[in-house]
Interface confidence: medium
């Protein structure tokens, strides 16, 4: 694919932020704020947690999630998986794009009850028009939202 | 805002690096090297720790800080906050853009009291001409500088 | 250097993924998949673990490595170093560009000896035609490969 950046076209970009409604507990992807505060969509659209591509090309996609807790919830595996996944009409299952595994629960010190950790992912992937990218965190109970600055999801065409 | 990338214009970008003077202990933002080694400014300017925008648009801004220590300094909260903040003439206080909280002091192993950790932030934000972006780390006593490769701050227009 | 983004030119970009052959144990840089799955090269070339620049300019370069283990291997220092390094014909040694140090082995919880951690690096550097960028991890024994989504290496011109 020869991809050109036309000088008269707007370069697709988006930055979506964490909100109280981000964590559904349903096993689905995280949901995001698309308009308020720092959030915006430019040349990309949004649907049920997904960034939807309107113009095919190579995109740098990224996500950060803020993790935190008091010890580890009962039954929680010691590993948190944070990933960016692609949905495409050409394939029935989500495809892993960028994934991290972390073991943050061991981070509390002897004197500190609370632990915090952060996971950042970013990389370039090719996306066709109509394809979607979502963020998943397993176990999402440890994701800490606050004001849209600590957990977020974005992309821009390169 | 419809933002176009003109083919005859230089795309603003910068990468600033950590230096011995970065940590002031004054409660202000981190200071950065702008010219030596890997550091550069192209279509952005610098003032007292801040990247200053000369051309409005959407920018991918990023920062990494290298953290490290031996145990935790007495009285240090168990959480380190690393953030990118915007200063704008239209508002008296700094605005949080991208923030991470980490509990790195719990990372010392049983055989080693020395620990290292790294915090990376990156995301797309809209910046107007004249607005500034700074990096803050609380508590900055745990930031470890060396040669400009471990702690840095940059941006480029998308 | 005045760098222009011509509208008729392809913008150089690449994303290389971890594979079974990535870890050589030879003391050299990590090796990468360049064609299969999510991996691609566009306006950049590849040679023995290195992204090779064909067009001079400023590039956002990035790498993530997935780390993991059961306790810490005997004799392993408590610090893992993950870095992006430049090779240039003008200088005999590799030059550090972006580096992180982490102490992940302390992350095992009391209930689990298994730990996971991830290291992400990204930043803008100037690269001349013919210069190369490689990824190194010391000690690479703790890098965990799987399917190309957890450890990767990429770049794009800004």
């Amino acid at each position: 694919l020869i991809q050109e950046r036309r000088s008269h076209e707007v370069n697709p970009a988006a930055h979506l932020t964490g909100a109280n409604s981000s964590l559904t507990g349903s096993g689905g992807p995280l949901l995001w704020e698309t308009q308020l505060g720092l959030a915006f969509l430019r040349g990309l659209s949004y649907h049920d947690g997904a960034l939807v591509v309107t113009k095919a090309g190579y995109y740098y996609i990224y996500s950060k999630v803020q993790l935190g807790g008091v010890g580890c919830p009962l039954g929680l595996a010691s590993t948190i998986t944070h990933g960016l996944y692609k949905r495409t009409p050409r394939y029935p299952e989500e495809l892993e794009l960028l994934v991290s595994q972390q073991s943050p629960c061991g981070r509390a010190t002897s004197s500190s009850r609370v632990w915090w950790d952060s996971s950042f992912l970013g990389g370039v992937v090719h996306l066709e028009a109509g394809e979607e990218v979502v963020v998943r965190v397993l176990d999402e109970r440890l994701v800490r939202l606050r004001d849209g600055t600590r957990s977020y999801f974005g992309a821009f065409m390169v | 805002l419809i933002q176009e990338r003109r083919s005859h214009e230089v795309n603003p970008a910068a990468h600033l690096t950590g230096a011995n003077s970065s940590l002031t202990g004054s409660g202000g933002p981190l200071l950065w090297e702008t010219q030596l080694g890997l550091a550069f400014l192209r279509g952005l300017s610098y003032h007292d720790g801040a990247l200053v925008v000369t051309k409005a648009g959407y920018y991918y801004i990023y920062s990494k800080v290298q953290l490290g220590g031996v145990g935790c300094p007495l009285g240090l909260a168990s959480t380190i906050t690393h953030g990118l903040y915007k200063r704008t003439p239209r508002y008296p206080e700094e605005l949080e853009l991208l923030v991470s909280q980490q509990s790195p002091c719990g990372r010392a192993t049983s055989s080693s009291r020395v620990w290292w950790d790294s915090s990376f932030l990156g995301g797309v934000v809209h910046l107007e001409a004249g607005e500034e972006v700074v990096v803050r780390v609380l508590d900055e006593r745990l930031v470890r500088l060396r040669d400009g490769t471990r702690s840095y701050f940059g941006a480029f227009m998308v | 250097l005045i760098q222009e983004r011509r509208s008729h030119e392809v913008n150089p970009a690449a994303h290389l993924t971890g594979a079974n052959s990535s870890l050589t144990g030879s003391g050299g840089p990590l090796l990468w998949e360049t064609q299969l799955g999510l991996a691609f090269l566009r306006g950049l070339s590849y040679h023995d673990g290195a992204l090779v620049v064909t067009k001079a300019g400023y590039y956002y370069i990035y790498s993530k490595v997935q780390l993991g283990g059961v306790g810490c291997p005997l004799g392993l220092a408590s610090t893992i170093t993950h870095g992006l390094y430049k090779r240039t014909p003008r200088y005999p040694e590799e030059l550090e560009l972006l580096v992180s140090q982490q102490s992940p082995c302390g992350r095992a919880t009391s209930s689990s000896r298994v730990w996971w951690d991830s290291s992400f690096l990204g930043g803008v550097v100037h690269l001349e035609a013919g210069e190369e960028v490689v990824v190194r991890v010391l000690d690479e024994r703790l890098v965990r490969l799987r399917d190309g989504t957890r450890s990767y290496f990429g770049a794009f011109m800004v």
Epitope: G18, N20, S22, L23, G25, G68, G69, V70, G71, C72, P73, L74, G75, L76, S111, S112, R113, V114, E140, R141, V143, R144, L145, R146 | G75, L76, A77, S78, T79, T81, Q101, L138, D139 | S110, S111
Partner: antibody
Framework: QVQLQQWGAGLLKPSETLSLTCAVY????????WHWIRQPPGKGLEWIGE???????NYNPSLKSRVTISVDTSKNQFSLKLSSVTAADTAVYYC????????????????WGQGTTVTVSS | AIQLTQSPSSLSASVGDRVTITCRAS??????FAWYQQKPGKAPKLLIY???SLESGVPSRFSGSGSGTDFTLTISSLQPEDFATYYC?????????FGGGTKVEIK
């Protein structure tokens, strides 16, 4: 609606062991941190200890040598034992649930027992 | 242990007044912080958790702010049922600690 019902001996002699039990009704036991807090007459609140959602116990160092918190998940109950009591242990004792709100912290105690007045007197 | 210094220890106010209670921690505790209201003979009641989040069912005239070492509880317009003792609490470090309390009385 979650309720905490607590019971135990209200009058003790010095050197005896205080024993209180708290039952959780109308809600889940797992996934929360459970605490004991006390309040001496006319004074402020003092944290005694907790049993966390992962099953670990943590105690106030000032009481650590004398306190034990245990749990019986099959009965949705947790208990407090405080040995070698003195008059200084006279207080109202509360069992408490720590909130667990997805996306924020756990940082608040949202459900309290009715309190048990314990008097230590010879 | 982290000390929480609450001020004032008592205050007199009238219905409709704006009341502010502060709590200062001896070291940083981020947002691991809560405020409670206690009336005589009753268990404390959670008002604010995570430093600034309003507990369900608590009137919106109560608000919390602050992060790090300095925290504030504000009652925007004091109501007759608000006369009580208020406590702050930190959750960041062991042992968990409470402030000494602020008694809000009728002027």
């Amino acid at each position: 609606q979650v309720q905490l019902q607590q019971w135990g001996a209200g009058l003790l002699k010095p050197s005896e062991t205080l024993s209180l039990t708290c039952a959780v009704y109308g809600g889940s036991f797992s996934g929360y941190n459970w605490h004991w807090i006390r309040q001496p007459p006319g004074k402020g609140l003092e944290w005694i200890g907790e049993i966390t959602h992962s099953g670990s116990t943590n105690y106030n160092p000032s009481l650590k040598s004398r306190v034990t918190i245990s749990v019986d998940t099959s009965k949705n109950q947790f208990s407090l034992k405080l040995s070698s009591v003195t008059a200084a242990d006279t207080a109202v004792y509360y069992c408490v649930r720590e909130i667990a709100v997805a996306g924020t912290g756990y940082y608040g105690m949202d459900v309290w027992g009715q309190g048990t007045t314990v008097t230590v007197s010879s | 242990a982290i000390q929480l210094t609450q001020s004032p220890s008592s205050l007199s106010a009238s219905v409709g007044d704006r009341v502010t209670i502060t709590c200062r921690a001896s070291q940083g505790i981020n947002s691991a912080f809560a405020w409670y209201q206690q009336k005589p003979g009753k268990a404390p009641k959670l008002l604010i958790y995570d430093a600034s989040s309003l507990e369900s069912g608590v009137p919106s005239r109560f608000s919390g702010s602050g992060s790090g070492t300095d925290f504030t509880l504000t009652i925007s317009s004091l109501q007759p049922e608000d006369f009580a003792t208020y406590y702050c609490q930190q959750f960041n470090s062991y042992p968990l600690t409470f402030g000494g309390g602020t008694k809000v009385e009728i002027k």
